[in-house]
């Protein structure tokens, strides 16, 4: 149940996909990844106001309880709904290999 | 990759399963759910310090980039890794039915 995609906080403030450019040094990968030297990391960032992109029933419950008990129950959180795979060229004990990572880059986002 | 389960912030402060008691009124379900009248909602609450229960590579990246750019990239978030199903007795147009919800109660938690 991907509820409302309209952000009541204003354009771009709610949970959505952002791209952050990161070097291998930034990621702490410089000692084992050969390429790419820079990664366009797609990640989910933004607020999750009431029912915005609610992933499921649990997210809807969380919204209701956060409204009642904001100090106890946090608001839903903006996280990946799915991922895009990425292939890296990496050093291994035996040499150099291509390795696919299925859970590295966010593809789209929801609130949970 | 369920990295470190040791919480560096002190016992119970990191991402884990909590139970919150909620009435149908609290949940906004009073008009369509007959039973149970009260739900023991299990949800994921707590901090996600570096590599604590990192769900996957994306969570590890997020930790690294949050450390570098805390104003741009949020820390990983404590969310359900899986769910326990729950059966509700609910009102329908045609009467009363039993309905299973697979995504209502968190079963365990991770950081993403």
């Amino acid at each position: 149940a991907r509820n409302g995609d309209h952000c009541p906080l204003g354009p771009g403030r709610c949970c959505r996909l952002h791209t952050v450019r990161a070097s291998l040094e930034d990621l702490g990968w410089a000692d084992w990844v050969l390429s790419p030297r820079e990664v366009q990391v797609t990640m989910c960032i933004g607020a999750c106001p009431s029912q915005f992109r609610a992933a499921n029933m649990h997210a809807q419950i969380k919204t209701s309880l956060h409204r009642l008990k904001p100090d106890t129950v946090p608001a839903p959180c903006c996280v990946p709904a799915s991922y895009n795979p990425m292939v890296l060229i990496q050093k291994t004990d035996t040499g150099v290999s291509l390795q696919t990572y299925d859970d590295l880059l966010a593809k789209d986002c929801h609130c949970i | 990759a369920r990295n470190g389960d040791h919480c560096p912030l002190g016992p119970g402060r990191c991402c884990r399963l909590h139970t919150v008691r909620a009435s149908l009124e609290d949940l906004g379900w009073a008009d369509w759910v007959l039973s149970p009248r009260e739900v023991q909602v299990t949800m994921c609450i707590g901090a996600c310090p570096s590599q604590f229960r990192a769900a996957n590579m994306h969570a590890q990246i997020k930790t690294s980039l949050h450390r570098l750019k805390p104003d741009t990239v949020p820390a990983p978030c404590c969310v359900p890794a899986s769910y326990n199903p729950m059966v509700l007795i609910q009102k329908t147009d045609t009467g009363v039915s039993l309905q299973t919800y697979d995504d209502l109660l968190a079963k365990d938690c991770h950081c993403i």
């Epitope: 050969l34 390429s35 790419p36 795979p85 292939v87 060229i89 150099v96 291509l98 696919t100 | -």
Partner: antibody, heavy 120, light 107 residues
Framework: QVQLVQSGAEVKKPGATVKVSCKAS????????MSWVRQAPGQGLEWMGY????????VYAQKLQGRVTMTTDTSTSTAYMELRSLRSDDTAVYYC?????????????WGQGTLVTVSS | DIQMTQSPSSVSASVGDRVTITCRAS??????LAWYQQKPGKAPKLLIY???SLQSGVPSRFSGSGSGTDFTLTISSLQPEDFATYYC?????????FGGGTKVEIK
Amino acid sequence: QVQLVQSGAEVKKPGATVKVSCKASGYTFDSLGMSWVRQAPGQGLEWMGYISTYSGDTVYAQKLQGRVTMTTDTSTSTAYMELRSLRSDDTAVYYCARESGQQVSALDPWGQGTLVTVSS
Amino acid sequence: DIQMTQSPSSVSASVGDRVTITCRASQGISRWLAWYQQKPGKAPKLLIYAASSLQSGVPSRFSGSGSGTDFTLTISSLQPEDFATYYCQQGASFPLTFGGGTKVEIK
């Protein structure tokens, strides 16, 4: 624009060694690795190996292991491929091809090719 | 090594025709498949990467699809400049391997 310019055609005798160069321009040379691919006359494409232009790490096709060496000179933004103990079936057009900026295991752009003829 | 099998090996078509070339990998390669076009005496040119992403500057009549082991390159409306040989290439593991090529000829 991004360009890979290769050295000229070579004629070699069996048992000899050939060294083909590939000069890169239009991008930061050590940011993207380089593959070498060859194509025998009228045949398909055969990948020979890859070199990280950043670290110098290499991986070679099994059938060429021990005969091929790939190197780079970052000061001149040039990649080299040396093939030893040449045989007649090494006669081919040799291409350098940069890893694509979009996907490391796709190749773009390619050099214009260097024809190496092995003949006694 | 991962074997790449391309079919057909040649196809005769006319300008305006829709042409489909298939490529099969001997094992799953996720979506790490690239397509290249090669004209006689020229170097190959990247058309499609990651199975379906169109390389910058490539006309939109070219499209790619598939994942796992089965992939397709489609030319929606063949143009005179499209008569060439097309190769697929897997990029999931070393050694990189190419299909045998498909020659698109004028009917």
